[in-house]
């Protein structure tokens, strides 16, 4: 029977660094190794018929134990695929591999309005681009952390918000008097140090009402 | 045939560093990664980490991360392994192996001992 | 990361006896578990892999068997040089060894 496995499922390096993804087979009188690259919607052919692609090739280098990266960058994250089949045969195993490339997070930019309308629903955004893996993010108001629920601490007991970690959107509905305060956001991915935004003050505004 | 041929025993004191080298032959060296594996007397066996010699990219054990270093001369086909900060629980055997997926080589072991 | 539960930690036996180890995993490892022969002063000699590939050389009287979590080394009729440390490796996910069994005379 063919095997086709790698002890390295999951491989995290820092960016540019050197890697190898693994891929060690049995079972092949005359093994074909293939290895593709999936990222979302991409795919690429890094390796085809033992030899490094020419798109990897200044970069990538096949070995009969898998494939070593001189030095990687953060568009190299994804899942990549060990295929092997017998040459001229019907054997054949495959083995995904997925790497992450460690980026630390940049400084987050916050979109935040400096006046609100109480009553009203009022959405602060926050995100940074570099992280990976992709940043979580922490918001706070007047330096304090503001918990994922509101009612949970007496200090936003007041607040009604809704607050994504994963898409750093902070949505008030319906903003409160009491929202009014001092925020700024904090992204981190579990690599390098967490980067904090600037802080921008919000208003919470009385409902202009006409004579 | 292949071989991996290490390095002497060390007698090392508390705070210091050793240095253990695994000479490889019989097979072509930058095509495996080199793993190191720790025996404490009349212990069972403890995987350190591994370099890839033909890039140099390594991985270490949690356990080790931070006091051990593994690199590779690939103009001599020696895999090194030091360990820094030594304390006395370090007395013990430490070996090279190669990875296939598993281990199917291994050095004849190298007895380091940290004493005052 | 993948704990390997390794027993018993000693054994003893006689010339003959059919003797078994067993390795447990804490999570199925797919049938990537090795096993290697320790005597003293010796280093780790590999006698199984893929649960039950016997490596060349080594004499039929050993065997691998397992899925999953839980695996078996047998050695079917104890020979004199088989008194030694019996080890398990798993594979699967990065590289972890069992505890050691050592199989000693009666």
């Known amino acids: 029977s063919v095997t086709v496995h790698s002890s390295e499922p999951e491989v995290r390096i820092p960016e540019n660094n050197p890697v190898k993804l693994s891929c060690a087979y049995s079972g092949f009188s005359s093994p074909r190794v293939e290895w593709k690259f999936d990222q979302g919607d991409t795919t690429r052919l890094v390796c085809y018929n033992n030899k490094i692609t020419a798109s990897y090739e200044d970069r990538v280098t096949f070995l009969p134990t898998g494939i070593t990266f001189k030095s990687v960058t953060r568009e190299d994250t994804g899942t990549y695929t060990c295929m092997v089949s017998e040459e001229g045969g019907n054997s054949y195993g495959e083995v995904k591999v997925k790497l992450i490339v460690l980026v630390p997070p940049s400084k987050p930019t916050v979109n935040i309005p400096s006046s609100a309308t109480i009553g009203n629903r009022a959405v602060l955004t926050c995100s940074e681009q570099d992280g990976s893996p992709p940043s979580e993010y922490t918001w706070f108001k007047d330096g304090i952390v503001m918990p994922t629920n509101p009612k949970s601490t007496r200090a936003f007991s007041n607040s009604s918000y809704v607050l994504n970690p994963t898409t750093g959107e902070l949505v008030f509905d319906p903003l409160s008097a009491s929202d009014t305060g001092e925020y700024s956001c904090e992204a981190r991915n579990g690599y390098g140090t967490p980067m904090t935004s600037n802080a921008v003050r919000m208003e919470a505004v009385e409902r202009n009402v006409g004579v | 045939e292949v071989q991996l041929v290490q390095s002497g025993a060390e007698v090392k004191k508390p705070g210091a560093s050793v240095k253990v080298s695994c000479k490889a032959s019989?097979?072509?060296?930058?095509?495996?990664?080199m793993h190191w594996v720790q025996q404490a007397p009349g212990q069972g066996l403890e995987w350190m980490g591994y370099?890839?010699?033909?890039?140099?990219?390594?991985r270490y054990s949690e356990k080790f991360q931070g006091r051990v270093t593994i690199t590779a001369d690939t103009s001599t086909d020696t895999a090194y392994m030091e360990l820094s900060s030594l304390r006395s629980e370090d007395t013990a055997v430490y070996y090279c192996?190669?990875?296939?997926?598993?281990?199917?080589?291994w050095g004849q072991g190298t007895l380091v001992t940290v004493s005052s | 990361d993948i704990q390997m539960t390794q027993s018993p930690f000693s054994l003893s036996a006689s010339v003959g006896d059919r003797v078994t180890i067993t390795c447990q995993a804490s999570?199925?490892?797919?049938?990537?578990i090795a096993w290697y022969q320790q005597k003293p002063a010796k280093a780790p000699k590999l006698f199984i892999h893929?649960?039950?590939t016997l490596e060349s050389g080594v004499p039929s009287r050993f065997s691998g068997s397992g899925s999953g979590t839980d695996y078996t080394l047998t050695i079917s009729s104890l020979q004199p040089e088989d008194f030694a440390t019996y080890y398990c490796l798993q594979y699967d996910n990065l590289w972890t060894f069992g505890q050691g069994t050592k199989v000693e005379i009666k």
């Open positions: 019989g097979y072509s060296f930058t095509d495996y990664s």
């Open positions: 370099i890839d010699p033909y890039n140099g990219g390594t």
């Open positions: 192996a190669r990875q296939t997926d598993y281990f199917d080589y």
């Open positions: 999570q199925d490892i797919n049938n990537y």
């Open positions: 893929y649960t039950s």
